[in-house]
C-alpha cells in the first residue's frame, strides 16, 4: 500500500474562566495518543464573553444563557462536529463568586445552577461548574506555566522555546493577579513549611514538588481599588476625594452604596454624611504608593516571615512568571521587557500618573475610559504588591517575567485545571512510545 499518513486523532477540551470582571472561554487541543506527554496540549482559541463576571448576574439570572451563547457557539464552530459529544466542558469560577458566596451561599448557588443548566444545553460533555478555591487557582496557574515551559519534561532541550526559559528543570513560581484576588505560588528552597495551610505536595511525571501557595482574597486589582477608596473616603472632609492614583483633571462620581457593596470594603465601612462622592485625580505616584501600602498590614506576623496580613511567605526562590492582570497592566504601560529595571519601572509610573487626563485620553483614544483611568492605580498597585507585599527587591525584580502567552497558550489557571481533571498529568514519568503520532501504513 501507498505510504499514507493516518489522520491524527485529536482531542479537545473547553474551560470557562468565570472571573470577577469577565468570563473567558478557552479551547485546548492535543493528540489523543500523546495525552500523557508534557507540553502537547495547546490553546487553539480564547473567546471573551461580552459583559461582566457571572457574579453580576445575581439579579438577572435569566440572562446568563444569552450571555454565554456567543462563545459557546464559537466553540461549536472551532471544534469538529464529530468531537462535540466527547469534548469536556468545565467552568471554574474564581474570586468574584467567592465573594458572592460570602455574602449569600444561596445566591451563589442560584447563579451556578443557571450556569450549569445553560452549559448542559450544548452538545458537549459538560462536566460541571464550580467555585474553585484560591489554593486551586494558585496551584493550577503554577502547573500551567511550568507545563508550557516544559519544566516537567525529563528530556533536556538544547534550545529554548521562550526567551526566558532556562534549560534547567527548576520550576518557575507563578504570580497571578485577577480583579478580586491575587495568588503567589512557588517551590521554596526549604522543604518544611511553617504554615500547612499554604503547603501543597504534588507528584508529577515521577518527581515530587513541595509547593507554597496563597491566594489573597480582596487583593485583586479591582477589589484593591475599592478597598483604597473606602479607606480614603473615611478621612475625606467632604464629598470630594482628591486621589493621587488618578490622573490630574480626572473626575468621577462614585455611589457610596456601590463602594460598600463588596465584602472587601466591610472593614472600612462607616456612616458617611453623603450618598455620593467625587474622585478628583491629582496624579501623584508617590502618594498613591503610600495610600496603597496602607492596605497591607505588615505590623503583625506570627511566622518567621510574612507577606502581609499575617500570612506566611517563605523566602522567594527562583524565577517567577507574572501573568493575567500583572501582564495586561504592565504590557499596556510598556513595562514587560526583561531589560527594564525596577527603578526604571517606578520612574515610568511616576511619569505616567502625572500626565493630565485629557492628554492620556488623546494618547490612548481607542481604550475604554473606565479601563484607561485605572492604569495609574493598577500599575502602582502591582509595584506595591510585588515589592512591599511579596518582598521582591530591585535585584530580584529581574527574576519576574511578565508573561501573556507561552507557546500560544495563555498563562493562567485554566490549562492546569483541565490537565488535572482530564488526568493528563501522570504522577509517574510515562514510558516513551516508539512511534510518533504520524504513523505510516
Amino acid at each position: 500500500t501507498q505510504n499514507k499518513a493516518l489522520p491524527e486523532n485529536i482531542k479537545y477540551g473547553i474551560v470557562l474562566d468565570a472571573g470577577s470582571s469577565h468570563t473567558s472561554l478557552y479551547i485546548y487541543k492535543w493528540p489523543a495518543e500523546k495525552e500523557n506527554d508534557t507540553g502537547v496540549v495547546h490553546q487553539v482559541e480564547e473567546c471573551r464573553v461580552k459583559g461582566p463576571g457571572i457574579s453580576k448576574y445575581v439579579q438577572k439570572v435569566n440572562e446568563i444563557g444569552i450571555y454565554l451563547t456567543d462563545c459557546m457557539e464559537r466553540a461549536r464552530e472551532v471544534i469538529p462536529r464529530s468531537q462535540h459529544q466527547e469534548t469536556p466542558v468545565y467552568l471554574g469560577a474564581t474570586a468574584g463568586m467567592r465573594l458572592l458566596r460570602m455574602e449569600s451561599e444561596e445566591l451563589a448557588d442560584r447563579v451556578l445552577d443557571v450556569v450549569e443548566r445553560s452549559l448542559s444545553n450544548y452538545p458537549f460533555d459538560f462536566q460541571g461548574a464550580r467555585i474553585i478555591t484560591g489554593q486551586e487557582e494558585g496551584a493550577y496557574g503554577w502547573i500551567t506555566i511550568n507545563y508550557l515551559l516544559g519544566k516537567f519534561s525529563q528530556k533536556t532541550r538544547w534550545f529554548s522555546i521562550v526567551p526566558y526559559e532556562t534549560n534547567n528543570q527548576e520550576t518557575f513560581g507563578a504570580l497571578d493577579l485577577g480583579g478580586a484576588s491575587t495568588q503567589i505560588t512557588f517551590v521554596p528552597q526549604n522543604q518544611t513549611t511553617e504554615s500547612p495551610d499554604n503547603a501543597l505536595q504534588f507528584r508529577l511525571y515521577g518527581k515530587d514538588y513541595n509547593v507554597y501557595t496563597h491566594s489573597f482574597l480582596c487583593y485583586g486589582k479591582d477589589q484593591a481599588l475599592w478597598q483604597k477608596l473606602a479607606k480614603d473616603i473615611q478621612v475625606a472632609s467632604n464629598e470630594i476625594l482628591r486621589d493621587p492614583c488618578f490622573h490630574p483633571g480626572y473626575k468621577k462620581v462614585v455611589n457610596v452604596s456601590d463602594l460598600y457593596k463588596t465584602p472587601c470594603t466591610k472593614r472600612f465601612e462607616m456612616t458617611l454624611p453623603f450618598q455620593q462622592f467625587e474622585i478628583q485625580g491629582i496624579g501623584n505616584y508617590q502618594q498613591c504608593h503610600q495610600s496603597v501600602l496602607e492596605l497591607f498590614n505588615t505590623s503583625y506576623c506570627p511566622y518567621s516571615q510574612c507577606a502581609f496580613n499575617g500570612i506566611f511567605l517563605p523566602p522567594l526562590q527562583g524565577d517567577f512568571g507574572a501573568f493575567s492582570a500583572f501582564y495586561f497592566v504592565m504590557n499596556f504601560l510598556n513595562l514587560t521587557s526583561e531589560k527594564v529595571s525596577q527603578e526604571k519601572v517606578t520612574e515610568m509610573m511616576k511619569k505616567f500618573c502625572s500626565q493630565p487626563w485629557e492628554e492620556i485620553k488623546t494618547s490612548y483614544a481607542g481604550v475604554k475610559e473606565k479601563y484607561l483611568s485605572e492604569y495609574c492605580f493598577s500599575g502602582t498597585y502591582i509595584l506595591s504588591l510585588l515589592l512591599q507585599g511579596y518582598h521582591f527587591t530591585a535585584d530580584s525584580w529581574e527574576h519576574i517575567h511578565f508573561i501573556g502567552k507561552i507557546q500560544g497558550s495563555d498563562a493562567g489557571w485554566t490549562l492546569g485545571y483541565m490537565l488535572n481533571l482530564t488526568n493528563m498529568i501522570p504522577a509517574e514519568q510515562p514510558l516513551s512510545t516508539p512511534l510518533s503520532h504520524s504513523t505510516y501504513v
Epitope: 462536529r81 464529530s82 462535540h84 459529544q85 448542559s120 444545553n121 452538545p123 460533555d125 459538560f126
Partner: antibody, heavy 121, light 107 residues
Framework: EVKLEESGGGLVQPGGSMKLSCVAS????????MNWVRQSPEKGLEWVAE??????????HYAESVKGRFTISRDDSKNNVYLQMNNLRPEDTGIYYC????????????WGAGTTVTVSS | DIVMTQSPAILSVTPGDRVSLSCRAS??????LHWYQQKSHESPRLLIK???QSISGIPSRFSGSGSGSNFTLSINSVEPEDVGVYFC?????????FGAGTKLELR
Amino acid sequence: EVKLEESGGGLVQPGGSMKLSCVASGFTFSKYWMNWVRQSPEKGLEWVAEIRLKSNKYGTHYAESVKGRFTISRDDSKNNVYLQMNNLRPEDTGIYYCTTQLDLYWFFDVWGAGTTVTVSS
Amino acid sequence: DIVMTQSPAILSVTPGDRVSLSCRASQSISDYLHWYQQKSHESPRLLIKYASQSISGIPSRFSGSGSGSNFTLSINSVEPEDVGVYFCQNGHSLPLTFGAGTKLELR
C-alpha cells in the same frame, strides 16, 4: 440489525400516569444519547426528551410542554430507556417514538415503530 | 425556541418531476438542518443530515441545500414511492423542533 422497540402505550384518563419503555438492540446502547419524539395530527412531530450518557451524569433535557411532568431515564445494563409520564393531559395524546442518533447528534437516524398513548376520559 | 416553517403544505406532482420543498428557520441555524420522510403508517426516516449530507441507503435523487435560515430539499425525478410527508428539523439547539411538514402526493 439496529432496532428500537417501544411498549407501554394505551388509554389513560387525564391526570393519570403511564410509563413507556423502549428496548434497544444491534448497537452499543450505553454509548448513545436517547430521545423520545411524539407525533399527533394537531401538533405534528414534537421532540419530548433526551437523556445523555453516564459520563454526562445521565443529563436530561425536556420540551417545555412536558417539563415537571415527564421523566426520561435509562438502564444501560438492560439496554432500556423509559419515559415516565405523570399528570397526563389530552394534548399528550399521540404516537410516542423512541429514537437515537448513531451518527453525531440532534438528528434521528434510528426510530422505533412507536407506541400510541391516548389521554381521554 | 426556533420555529421551523415549511412550504408548501401540499405538493401535487407527476412521476419524473423535479421538485423543491422549502424550510425556513426563525433564526440562523448554520447547517444544523435535517430532513425526514414519513410514509403512511410508518415511522419517519432520515433523508438528509446537516442540510446537504446524504445518508447511506437513501436514493441519490434526494438532495439538500441551504445554510443559515433557508433550506431546500430537492427530489431530482419523483418516483411513485416518494409519496408521503417530508419534515425538516432544527438540529442546532434545544428544544429540537420540526416543521409542520410538506405532503407530497401524486397528481
